[in-house]
Amino acid sequence: FERTRSLQDPCSNCPAGTFCDNNRNQICSPCPPNSFSSAGGQRTCDICRQCKGVFRTRKECSSTSNAECDCTPGFHCLGAGCSMCEQDCKQGQELTKKGCKDCCFGTFNDQKRGICRPWTNCSLDGKSVLVNGTKERDVVCGPSPADLSPGASSVTPPAPAREPGHSPQ
């Protein structure tokens, strides 16, 4: 690596992937192993993120960019940059502080993450229940009762008196 020739800041010519090394008369030195600099003119290289524990490496660190992590099977990312991994649950369940719990009656979750949500209240739209809800699936609303042929009936369950919970982080 050539010594920079800038008269103002001798470090300004050090490219990404290097740092301006004060121990070597401000020569541009390559980043040490497992470190990077994503911009030029840096006086230190940043140490690469290590994907450990429930994290696994999605993108390896290079001399110019940090590593990126995702989660091992059975877990999913939470937050920007996959800052945490949260345990997966089955469809029809939600994660609580005590682990995965089945959705209460009147609620459902069709994913392996997130919270149980109340079934749609078809009657609010003036419709009837065409297909009953389950722990894994929302109800399917059909035509309004007035649209049904004479003699047909439909039961709309009351909306559950339950606040949706929040998955612990």
Epitope: D46, Q50, K52, G53, Q169
Partner: antibody, heavy 118, light 112 residues
Framework: QVQLQESGPGLVKPSETLSLTCTVS????????WSWIRQPPGKGLEWIGY???????NYNPSLKSRVTISVDTSKNQFSLKLSSVTAADTAVYYC????????????WGQGTLVTVSS | EIVMTQSPLSLPVTPGEPASISCRSS???????????LDWYLQKPGQSPQLLIY???NRASGVPDRFSGSGSGTDFTLKISRVEAEDVGVYYC?????????FGQGTKLEIK
């Protein structure tokens, strides 16, 4: 280059809450973990906890019930609150940039001494 | 939690002579691709700690090359090839494999 600066009261009464703020300059608070570490006078280092810029936290189990770390990305700051303090919480408190969520503290603040006394 | 044990706790050295500090962890710090989650820090008198070595053997950028780290698994060593007066302070090893990260009790290097 990245610089960190701790600020907050140097004296806290027993049973009250210790509150400190770390201001990050020379770089964005985004994309990194940010830790608090403390050192009682004449003793070794103890990690308190970290926060990611998105708000995710992880605390030392020995302090978890008393610790809250928060972040304000608009001000490039993160903060520590430690409740129900006793004399044993007297220490120099450091903020540091944490490269991997509990490892390789590459940039440190200069530290601030907090004394717990009535 | 992982317990870190350093030796010696005090290390008087003559300038220009080598120095060596040992650090042992209660469980292996070796992780994927041969990466050891072990850092070394130096805390000079009246200052905050500074990172010297990460990953067991990687010298942080800007750290003089007289400092080197070695070892794997549970046994690690920090070596200073020729001690200088500015190297005085307390040296800490720290495991970064598991939360909470934990530090050794420190080794105080002083000039004879």
């Amino acid at each position: 280059q990245v610089q960190l600066q701790e600020s907050g009261p140097g004296l806290v009464k027993p049973s009250e809450t210790l509150s400190l703020t770390c201001t990050v300059s020379g770089g964005s608070i985004s994309s990194y973990y940010w830790s608090w570490i403390r050192q009682p006078p004449g003793k070794g280092l103890e990690w308190i906890g970290y926060i990611y810029y998105s708000g995710s936290t992880n605390y030392n189990p020995s302090l978890k019930s008393r610790v809250t770390i928060s972040v304000d990305t608009s001000k490039n700051q993160f903060s520590l609150k430690l409740s129900s303090v006793t004399a044993a919480d007297t220490a120099v408190y450091y903020c540091a940039r944490d490269q991997s969520g509990g490892g390789s503290f590459q940039h440190w603040g200069q530290g601030t001494l907090v004394t717990v006394s009535s | 939690e992982i317990v870190m044990t350093q030796s010696p706790l005090s290390l008087p050295v003559t300038p220009g002579e080598p120095a060596s500090i040992s650090c042992r962890s209660s469980q292996s710090l070796l992780y994927s691709q041969g990466y050891n989650h072990l850092d070394w820090y130096l805390q000079k008198p009246g200052q905050s700690p500074q990172l010297l070595i990460y990953g067991g053997s990687n010298r942080a950028s800007g750290v003089p090359d007289r400092f080197s780290g070695s070892g794997s698994g549970t046994d690690f060593t920090l070596k200073i090839s020729r001690v200088e007066a500015e190297d005085v302070g307390v040296y800490y090893c720290m495991q970064a494999l598991q939360t909470p990260p934990t530090f050794g009790q420190g080794t105080k290097l002083e000039i004879k």
